[in-house]
Amino acid sequence: VPRWRQQWSGPGTTKRFPETVLARCVKYTEIHPEMRHVDCQSVWDAFKGAFISKHPCNITEEDYQPLMKLGTQTVPCNKILLWSRIKDLAHQFTQVQRDMFTLEDTLLGYLADDLTWCGEFNTSKINYQSCPDWRKDCSNNPVSVFWKTVSRRFAEAACDVVHVMLNGSRSKIFDKNSTFGSVEVHNLQPEKVQTLEAWVIHGGREDSRDLCQDPTIKELESIISKRNIQFSCKNIYRPDKFLQCVKNPEDSSCTSEI
């Protein structure tokens, strides 16, 4: 008789999740020699230990502490790029601007990017059928708690000028309920961070509005200012040209506003 299994509203664990985490760990430590001391099998064991045999609606940041410890990594604190709802462009940017880092350019972010995972209470099985949805089921699920934990730590590590890429095509350019709005903004350390600079990325080719005047950006400015951190904002009217100019800053067309 098959065991009764909880049906959650979200997609199940990514197929070959353990193998993917291990392969990514091997790749990351190959590309980043400063992380070659990392034991990928121990990393996987710690990752697994955070959610296996635990109720997937009862995961805590504490569950991820062994993994956080193994994945401890120093990134230049003044070269951090946060993003909200515009991951692909942020990643394209750091692939070109190699001295800047998104969370997914760190080991732990790289391991988990785009993956889903959860277990079942009291069994050592990974649930490949379904996992809790943040809205429909519970917020303290393995994936959400992981990203909350690593995002908090990443924001806490930032210093000097912190950049954030925001999606100007969305109705809420700054969304208080996003990871950036609910976690990272509140964990920037005012004693270390001087300025948060927002880059608002325009979607339409003919969109010449100043999206830095958007009410949600003003809301972000208010939150940041109240935390004694300066705020600045720039419109990126042409993201394609923006990337091209990051690649080739000497290009004559890159002197004008992009």
Epitope: P18, L22, C40
Partner: antibody, heavy 125, light 113 residues
Framework: QVQLQESGPGLVKPSQTLSLTCTVS??????????WSWIRQHPGKGLEWIGY???????YYNPSLKSRVTISVDTSKNQFSLKLSSVTAADTAVYYC?????????????????WGKGTTVTVSS | DIVMTQSPDSLAVSLGERATINCKSS????????????LAWYQQKPGQPPKLLIY???TRESGVPDRFSGSGSGTDFTLTISSLQAEDVAVYYC?????????FGGGTKVEIK
């Protein structure tokens, strides 16, 4: 083409550490896209996978043997090695080194396409 | 770990006749993302190391005679030797590489009747 050759003592005393080396010729151990593996075969029995190492040093061991296994790599000598501690008679086997295919983009572990000839290790006092 | 079960344990076939070996995995080794079965077949002759015959369940390794073929998907796989030759006398193993650790079947001994 790539060839693998195991070497090491054929007799090990119980409780001691078994040490074997695999020398790779005809290709560089440092070229990505491969995992370097150890497999053993007990007398008259099937095959048991022990573990792998990537040229960068990343390892993965069979959980059933993990507490006793260490695999290391020496890229300058084009060799990788196996150490198995606290051996008993149950560790008597033919030990093979092998190359497992992978991908360069994301190195998943695949099938083993090149094998060494194997070396017999007997655990006895 | 994924358990690989082979049948039969041994098989006696006349020269020129067909030999069929079965392999069953305790869970599917088909990866839906790329529609590939993570299964390999090896041949081991006495006193020799295993030799890769088939990978991705049905792709023949370079230099392997076309009388060897692999089929199946999910959990059930077959290695077929269409016309048995004297040099095919060996033990044949299936192996999954869908999940770590890789695991092997117990082997099937093929002899000449």
């Amino acid at each position: 083409q790539v060839q693998l050759q195991e070497s090491g003592p054929g007799l090990v005393k119980p409780s001691q550490t078994l040490s074997l080396t695999c020398t790779v010729s005809g290709g560089s151990i440092s070229s990505g896209g491969y995992y370097w593996s150890w497999i053993r075969q007990h007398p008259g029995k099937g095959l048991e996978w022990i573990g792998y190492i990537y040229y960068s040093g990343s390892t993965y061991y069979n959980p059933s043997l993990k507490s006793r296994v260490t695999i290391s790599v020496d890229t300058s000598k084009n060799q990788f090695s196996l150490k198995l501690s606290s051996v008993t008679a149950a560790d008597t086997a033919v030990y093979y080194c092998a190359r497992a295919k992978s991908e360069l983009v994301l190195p998943y572990y695949y099938y083993m396409d090149v094998w060494g000839k194997g070396t017999t290790v007997t655990v006895s006092s | 770990d994924i358990v690989m079960t082979q049948s039969p344990d041994s098989l006696a076939v006349s020269l020129g006749e067909r030999a069929t070996i079965n392999c069953k995995s305790s869970q599917s080794v088909l990866f839906s993302s790329n529609n590939k079965n993570y299964l390999a077949w090896y041949q081991q002759k006495p006193g020799q190391p295993p030799k890769l015959l088939i990978y991705w369940a049905s792709t023949r390794e370079s230099g392997v005679p076309d009388r060897f073929s692999g089929s199946g998907s999910g959990t059930d796989f077959t290695l077929t030797i269409s016309s048995l030759q004297a040099e095919d006398v060996a033990v044949y193993y299936c192996q999954q590489y869908y999940s770590l650790p890789p695991t092997f079947g117990g082997g099937t001994k093929v002899e000449i009747k």
